[in-house]
């Protein structure tokens, strides 16, 4: 089948307290391998300290996944989500406030 | 001083199951990640399955997911590895650690003794 | 899956030699690499965490260095209880994975 980008959303929730949950988000893309990680400072992070969902069927043929990681407050624009699917990458900052930024990558 | 224990190895028919346990001490276990990894009889070193600090998240190898469960209770200071539908491919030293923590991030910092496990009819 | 490629299989070197075991990623793992020695009869313990930094209680003639693929373990000056298999394990991302390991012996 033809390759599908995933888009890509990146959220932010309270944690305990001076601490946020950041989580990237990748869905509707195919095939299914992807690599889904958290970078501070451009270097990624340890698998322990971070977690990731499964990459499951979306029902639309496509596949969806997350990865989440806790950080400090006020230290967001230390860290990335990184993606890479099918030999294309990008990488998605953490949003400012409550807000959420959701784009597709574009080949 | 870090120790950790593990029982519930021995022999056991191919299709069968086994709960083995590790009994944590000299550290705060709820703190830690904790992980099972096995040393096949060729002494090659797989990790098996690593369960997160608080519980949440559990991460299996690919050739055990499905048939083992990683578990833990963080008041009896215990990780638990349920293995089921046991293949040939299994026999191995299991063996319990801990993870390294902020102090050696993706590391794993001690082992403890393993539990033998021979799957054989 | 990051597979990690050791080598040599196994070494012979006299005491007091400079011997390096090398491991390469085959994919980036930045610095989330760590190196164990295992004794003959005995348990891995943990010498080398962060592809460089020593683990509590571990001489200083044991020495790593590396990022991204390519990783190295040094002992400088071996000693007779440096006999054992060492191994390297990335801590990237799951699965985690060891390298096949070297074994060390005497002259």
């Known amino acids: 089948g033809s390759t599908v980008p995933p888009m890509v959303n990146v959220t932010r929730s309270e944690a305990s307290e001076g601490n946020i949950t950041v989580t990237c988000r990748a869905s509707g893309f195919y095939p299914w391998n992807i690599t889904l990680s958290w970078r501070q400072d451009g270097v990624s992070l340890s698998h322990d300290t971070q977690q990731w969902g499964d990459v499951l069927p979306d029902g639309n043929g496509t596949y969806q996944t997350w990865v989440a990681t806790r950080i400090c407050q006020g230290e967001e624009q230390r860290f990335t989500c990184y993606m890479e699917h099918s030999g294309n990458h990008s990488t998605h900052p953490v949003p400012s406030g409550n807000s959420h930024h959701h784009h597709h990558h574009h080949h | 001083e870090v120790q950790l224990v593990e029982s519930g190895g021995g022999l056991v028919k191919p299709g069968g199951s086994l709960k083995l346990s590790c009994a944590a001490s000299?550290?705060?276990?709820?703190?830690?990640?904790m992980y099972w990894v096995r040393q096949t009889p060729e002494k090659r070193l797989e990790w098996v399955a690593t369960i997160s600090d608080g519980i949440t998240y559990t991460y299996y190898s690919d050739s055990v997911r499905g048939r083992f469960t990683i578990s833990r209770d963080n008041a009896e200071n215990t990780l638990y590895l349920q293995m089921s539908s046991l293949k040939s491919e299994d026999t191995a030293m299991y063996y319990c650690s801990k993870g390294g923590g902020s102090t050696a991030r993706g590391a794993l910092d001690f082992w403890g003794q393993g539990t033998s496990v021979t799957v054989s009819s | 899956d990051i597979q990690m490629n050791q080598s040599p299989s196994s070494l012979s070197a006299s005491l007091g030699d400079t011997i390096t075991i090398t491991c390469h990623a085959s994919q980036n793992i930045h610095v989330w690499l760590s190196w164990y020695q295992q004794k003959p009869g005995n348990i891995p313990k943990l010498l080398i965490y962060g592809a460089s930094h020593l683990h509590t209680g571990v001489p200083s003639r044991f020495s790593g260095r590396g990022s991204g693929t390519g990783f190295t373990l040094t002992i400088s000056s071996l000693q007779p209880e440096d006999i054992a298999t060492y191994y390297c394990l990335q801590g990237q991302s799951y699965p985690l994975t060891f390298g096949s390991g070297t074994k060390v012996e005497i002259k």
């Open positions: 000299g550290f705060t276990f709820s703190d830690y990640y």
